[in-house]
């Protein structure tokens, strides 16, 4: 039961994390205008990975996509790549982990296969989370370097946007979910892998005993190979909505 819970929770946490990574990647507020040095602005600038936006204090917002590919900074391209790799790996991991869930029965799939799939999805989630964290961190580092660079004009200095914090949290959740899946994998291993032959050396000759009266406990719950699981599958619904706000100007 503990294995199922760990696996299920790992799946849900990873699902939320990947939804967050997708949201962060699509959001426009990766960097925002430095309002500390320009607190009276009536025009608020903010940028995402795919477009830059201007919100006027009148409430009108205009966004323009980055229509060039070669003209963009290499760092921005690298961050885009990291986030996309994170999303792709996460999506594949989710697909694999759905089939690996103990509460879902697919034909006569062996526990060993489910264990392998759980481990695979766990590793994918870990790498996905690391990609997102790396991407967001690279972007944040770029902003911080520009902010403290005396050669960069004040008007061009940018602050860390909300998307970065969403990305860090989402990457962290995906990473945690992946770790949980890897932990669950250890408890999913079939019975045979749980018992080890124990060798005793007595009075000059060797006698091997294979214990049959007890099971070596892994500490991750009892073996449930022959039990029916009736746990309901978790469903999550993530809606990401963005509304313009005038509070960005003062």
């Amino acid at each position: 039961m503990a294995v199922t819970a760990c696996q299920g929770l790992g799946f849900v946490v990873s699902l939320i994390g990947i939804a967050g990574i997708i949201a962060a990647t699509c959001m426009d507020q990766w960097s925002t205008q430095d309002l500390y040095n320009n607190p009276v602005t009536a025009v608020f600038n903010y940028q995402g990975l795919w477009r830059s936006c201007v919100r006027e204090s009148s409430g009108f917002t205009e966004c323009r996509g980055y229509f060039t590919l070669l003209g963009l900074p290499a760092m921005l391209q690298a961050v885009r790549a990291l986030m996309i790799v994170g999303i792709v790996l996460g999506a594949i991991g989710l697909l694999v982990s759905i089939f690996a869930l103990k509460c879902i029965r697919i034909g006569s799939m062996e526990d060993s296969a489910k264990a392998n799939m759980t481990l695979t999805s766990g590793i994918m989630f870990i790498v996905s989370g690391l990609c997102a964290i790396a991407g967001v961190s690279v972007f944040a580092n770029m902003l911080i370097q520009d902010f403290y660079n005396p050669l960069v004009a004040e008007a061009l200095k940018r602050e860390l946007g909300a998307s970065l914090f969403v990305g860090w949290v989402a990457g962290g959740l995906t990473l945690i979910g992946g770790v949980m899946m890897c932990i669950a994998c250890r408890g999913l291993a079939p019975e045979e892998t749980n018992y080890k032959a124990v060798s005793y050396h007595a009075s000059g000759h060797s006698v091997a005993y294979k214990p049959g009266g007890f099971k070596a406990s892994t500490g991750f719950g009892s073996n449930t190979k022959n039990k029916k699981i009736y746990d309901g599958g978790a469903r999550t619904e993530d809606e990401v909505q963005s509304y313009p706000s005038k509070h960005d100007y003062v």
Epitope: T41, V43, V54, S58, F60, V250
Partner: antibody
Framework: QVQLQQPGAELVRPGASVKLSCKAS????????INWVKQRPGQGLEWIGN????????NYNQKFKDKATLTVDKSSSTAYMQLSSPTSEDSAVYYC???????????WGQGTTLTVSS | DIVMTQSPSSLTVTAGEKVTMSCKSS????????????LTWYQQKPGQPPKLLIY???TRESGVPDRFTGSGSGTDFTLTISSVQAEDLAVYYC?????????FGSGTKLEIK
């Protein structure tokens, strides 16, 4: 069509506060900022401040911070500007305007002529 | 606060003539995010409230005759009336819409001979 209706004139005694009104019609009142502009006789224009009717968020020109208070009544789609302790310096035409693209003011009320006199 | 300086303070022209008036700001009104200048031109006829002519320094408001043209960038702006009509008799104001408080120029009074 969009209209901003203001009373033509107000007479107030020095020191007695006055509340000027601006009734909006022909558009969604809560979606656009309302600005107030002062014009003294034969003089230029001065921006007093603005208010976002949806949540009454305000910005003020520091010069008028202690003089003007902007409010709205969403139910009647009316914006108000209260002037405290008016003096002869406050005698002017006060316009309410609506914010538009480029933070410009696309619609203007006809203006209220405020006379401060004893 | 951004200071807006208009020149000349008044000018007299004959109908059909081309006229230009200047507006200078103490700080740049160019926004790097969209490369737009946050400067607006208004026309105020005697006894009337101001009327929006041009925003973003060069974008004509709908219904404004195309003889009115706004140009300039950064701190120097110009309003041009290609062929002045009798009904253009008014005071023309420029306004900073880039940062609070929004500030107006002192105006250019256009008179027709």
């Amino acid at each position: 069509q969009v209209q901003l209706q203001q009373p033509g004139a107000e007479l107030v005694r020095p020191g007695a506060s006055v509340k000027l009104s601006c009734k909006a019609s022909g558009y969604t009142f809560t979606s656009y900022w309302i600005n107030w502009v002062k014009q003294r006789p034969g003089q230029g224009l001065e921006w007093i401040g603005n208010i976002y009717p949806s949540d009454s968020y305000t910005n003020y020109n520091q010069k008028f911070k202690d003089k003007a208070t902007l409010t709205v009544d969403k139910s009647s789609s009316t914006a108000y500007m209260q002037l405290s302790s008016p003096t002869s310096e406050d005698s002017a035409v006060y316009y309410c305007t609506r914010s538009w693209r480029g933070n410009s003011f696309d619609y203007w009320g006809q203006g209220t002529t405020l006379t401060v006199s004893s | 606060d951004i200071v807006m300086t208009q020149s000349p303070s008044s000018l007299t022209v004959t109908a059909g003539e081309k006229v230009t008036m200047s507006c200078k700001s103490s700080q740049s009104l160019l926004n790097s995010g969209n490369q737009k200048n946050y400067l607006t031109w208004y026309q105020q006829k005697p006894g009337q409230p101001p009327k929006l002519l041009i925003y973003w320094a060069s974008t004509r408001e709908s219904g404004v005759p195309d003889r009115f043209t706004g140009s300039g960038s950064g701190t120097d702006f110009t309003l041009t009336i290609s062929s002045v009509q009798a009904e253009d008799l008014a005071v023309y104001y420029c306004q900073n819409d880039y940062s609070y408080p929004f500030t107006f120029g002192s105006g250019t009074k256009l008179e027709i001979k």
